[in-house]
């Protein structure tokens, strides 16, 4: 897991055409922030959404030589004190001298020094800095010792999750070594690593480490601006857990964040043990994510079980794509806290109707408008089958309200059914008493005529699934549909002549390919006569138009051939291309006509077995 060295090797590759031992770094314009180049960042040319420019610098341990290409010379090796000067950490060097640490780090021993850069000291709170400078023999010395380990540890030895005792009171240093090559110590990033010294190693870091002795729990209990979060954490029995050992990341909503929540929502969640625990756990990660480790969006699992996306936009951390972090990197002895100005609500703490997204607003508006929302009691369990907004045509929306209500009732199930609980042939009952059939295909799940889109969610009192079209439960059998449509009269007469009418009236699951009357236009009456006379041949042909199972065109993976076995025994080939069903490469005139015992696809030619 030596990510730092891997990224360094990549930066070396990107810099090699500039000469030996040259590394490519990426810098965000207008900042002094530089990063060794990862493969992704190299091509994307951006970090945290900000455009980067490439700088070519000597790789760690090398230097330029007058008139020569690249960095052909090795940096001189010195003791730790001297190395501080070589790497440009002159303020740390000066403070090491002033605090009488110089003697120690010039002498015998083996040390790792996490040396704040000059800029890091300049950014330190001026009161804290003055305090250190006014007491160099104790305060400053202790502070510098807290940046040191009494053995040499290169970045390859700094493993993710390590807690290493520092040289001040054995106070722990949290090491994180991230897959993107960032290495942090108490959330300070190593910006210049592995400067070997005769008696150790120096790593330059981007901030001064402040002493940490408290846990996340201690911080929450002491911080006035987290009183609402504290109360919620106590109610949901989470607070104590944040006092235990671990490597947590807590996104802690401030009081202002809680004030933004609608009153009723917070009261409902906090009055429900399961929902309140889910809410709290959704703000906690089991891994330590320092702000400096974030270079782009990445998904992390929370203690609640669902994921959140943590990203960045310039200097700001984003959570689920929104800038909401007010203060970052509050390091404690069991993790890190980022203060946020919004409360994150997981699906598991939401009411089923709250799960609907922007693409289902027509559906949710109608549910409210037609008085169906009140039927979704918080203590009940439901499943919403929510069509996307553009599934509702103007004609549908201008329907009689009673009819519209009946249609909507077909989209609400009496029970909570998750995506992973659906199976082929399953019958689901709606609140309107209708029964809906489930069809499961290789790459699609459909209910009656409509197939699902990505985006199913589970809430506190139900689930929601997203559908491409309005669900229309079938009313008539295959036989009734054929009888009702004049286009199919010839095929129907052949069906009756072959004694197969019964098959289409009984319950079952069939796919029927129905030729229109036009398909028979080219036939002479003699040919039709022959068909009717030879019952065996006729049955053979008719049964080739019938396949066991319900196969909806919209359920097929686009552009891929689906081979089905007909009742006659031969194979039939189906393919969905540009929303058109091809049957043995013939374009279907109309497809997915649902019936109570199957589905009809209309063709304009009689199909013959191969």
């Amino acid at each position: 897991n030596n990510h730092y060295d891997k990224i360094l090797a990549h930066s070396r590759i990107r810099g090699r055409d500039q000469g030996p031992n040259v590394c490519a770094l990426q810098q965000i314009l207008g900042t002094k922030k530089k990063y060794f180049s990862t493969c992704k960042n190299w091509y994307k040319k951006s970090i945290c959404g900000q455009k980067t420019t490439v700088l070519y610098e000597c790789c760690p341990g090398y230097m330029r030589m007058e008139g020569m290409k690249g960095c052909p010379a090795v940096l001189p090796i010195d003791h730790v004190y001297g190395t501080l000067g070589i790497v440009g950490a002159t303020t740390t060097q000066r403070y090491s001298d002033a605090s009488k640490l110089r003697e120690e780090i010039e002498g015998k021993g083996s040390f790792t020094y996490f040396a704040p850069s000059n800029e890091a000291w300049d950014n330190l709170d001026s009161d804290i800095r003055r305090g250190l400078e006014s007491n160099v023999n104790v305060e400053l010395l202790n502070a510098l010792h807290s940046h040191m380990i009494n053995k040499r540890m290169l970045t390859k030895d700094l493993k993710n999750g390590m807690i290493i005792p520092s040289m001040y009171n054995n106070l722990g240093l949290f090491i994180n070594h991230y897959p993107n090559g960032v290495v942090t110590v108490n959330c300070a990033r190593i910006i210049h690593g592995n400067q070997i010294a005769t008696n150790g190693v120096v790593h330059v870091i981007d901030r001064v480490l402040t002493q940490i002795g408290t846990s996340i729990q201690d911080f929450i209990e002491a911080e006035d601006d987290l009183s609402s979060f504290r109360a919620a954490a106590i109610t949901s029995d989470i607070l104590e857990a944040l006092g235990r050992d671990g490597h947590f990341t807590l996104f802690a909503p401030t009081n202002e964040a809680f004030e933004k929540l609608p009153r009723g929502v917070l009261e409902r969640i906090m009055g429900d043990k399961v929902a309140s625990e889910a809410l709290m756990k959704y703000h906690i990660l089991n891994t330590l994510q320092c702000s400096e480790s974030i270079m782009g969006g990445a998904v992390f699992e929370t203690l609640e079980g669902n994921t959140i996306e943590i990203g960045c936009d310039g200097d700001s951390i984003t959570v689920n794509g929104i800038k909401m972090v007010n203060k970052k990197d509050i390091v404690t002895n069991n993790g890190v806290i980022h203060l946020i100005d919004q409360v994150l609500i997981p699906d598991s703490a939401k009411q089923v109707i709250e799960l609907a997204g922007k693409q289902q607003t027509t559906f949710t508006d109608l549910v409210a408008q037609l008085g169906l929302a009140s039927a979704l009691r918080p203590d009940g369990e439901y499943t919403l089958l929510a069509p996307v907004n553009n599934a509702f045509s103007d004609d549908t929306l201008s329907m009689d309200q009673r009819l519209l209500k009946l249609i909507l009732q077909n989209h609400i199930l009496k029970v909570k059914v998750g995506l992973n609980e659906l199976y082929n042939g399953q019958i689901l009952e709606t609140i309107g008493g209708k029964q809906l059939r489930v069809f499961v295909y290789r790459t699609a799940v459909c209910i009656e005529n409509s197939c699902m889109e990505k985006g199913s969610k589970q809430g506190r009192n139900g689930a929601i699934h997203i559908f491409r079209e309005i669900i229309k439960p079938a009313e008539k059998s295959l036989h009734e549909k054929l009888k009702q449509d004049k286009r199919f009269s010839t095929f129907l007469s052949l069906l009756e002549a072959a004694d197969l009418k019964e098959l289409l009236t009984q319950p079952g699951d069939w796919t029927l390919f129905v030729p229109t009357n036009d398909a028979f236009k080219g036939m002479t009456s003699e040919e039709k006569e022959i068909l009717i006379r030879d019952k065996n041949a006729l049955q053979n042909i008719i049964l080739y138009h019938l396949t066991p199972g319900v196969f909806i065109g919209k359920g097929f993976e686009p552009g891929v051939t689906n081979i089905l076995k007909t009742t006659q025994g031969s194979k039939i080939f189906l393919k969905e291309v540009n929303d058109t069903l091809l049957v043995n490469e013939l374009k279907s005139k109309e497809s997915d006509i649902m019936t109570t015992n199957g589905v009809i696809h209309v063709v304009d030619k009689l199909l013959y077995p191969a």
Epitope: R14, A24, L29, G30, K40, W42, Y43, K44, K45, Q50, K51, T53, V54
Partner: antibody, heavy 119, light 103 residues
Framework: QVQLQQSGAELARPGASVKLSCKAS????????MQWVKQRPGQGLEWIGA????????RYTQRLKGKATLTADKSSSTAYMELSSLASEDSAVYYC????????????WGQGTSVTVSS | DIVMTQSQKFMSTSVGDRVSVTCKAS??????VAWFQQKPGQSPKTLIY???YRDSGVPDRFTGSGSGTDFTLTITNVQSEDLTDYFC?????????FGGGTR
Amino acid sequence: QVQLQQSGAELARPGASVKLSCKASGYSFTHYWMQWVKQRPGQGLEWIGAIYPGDGDTRYTQRLKGKATLTADKSSSTAYMELSSLASEDSAVYYCAREGEGNSAMDYWGQGTSVTVSS
Amino acid sequence: DIVMTQSQKFMSTSVGDRVSVTCKASQNVGSSVAWFQQKPGQSPKTLIYSASYRDSGVPDRFTGSGSGTDFTLTITNVQSEDLTDYFCLQYGTYPYTFGGGTR
């Protein structure tokens, strides 16, 4: 060799939409930003936006944010720009251009697609 | 947005002369500036990137210089085929912005 092949000229009515394409070949399509640039007759160049096909990330100039929508289809190595609610000021030649790696700017350009908006 | 100003819309020169086209950025763009040449009815062609690096195949009579806010494209020993339009572009920060062009 790197090539960017743009779709043919478009004539559209005011209020309509058009979708221009830019088919890339000769390089790894997902690894390079695709830029789109507008040039009105006799005028200078105006940057519209860019898409990174690797993850679909987009950038737009604020002025044309609602006007242009950039997409990319990795399977066909094709970048698209849809222009909506067309008006006469959208009549222009639109270029796609690949942005090179490192510190390079646009290094390869398409031949341009002329869009004429007229009733 | 960063504004790129090419103060001279037109410049006159003669074959064999040396000419300098300038471009000024409204704020620091480092060295993220490119220069393009565009002939009538053709797509732009990249001459210079990163302020001073010649694109492959570009004759060495074209040189770029500058950093921060002031940039120059110099053509020494001007040829007749060089008498056309030149645009600068800043690509250090989004949105990218072009200069108005110099003919």
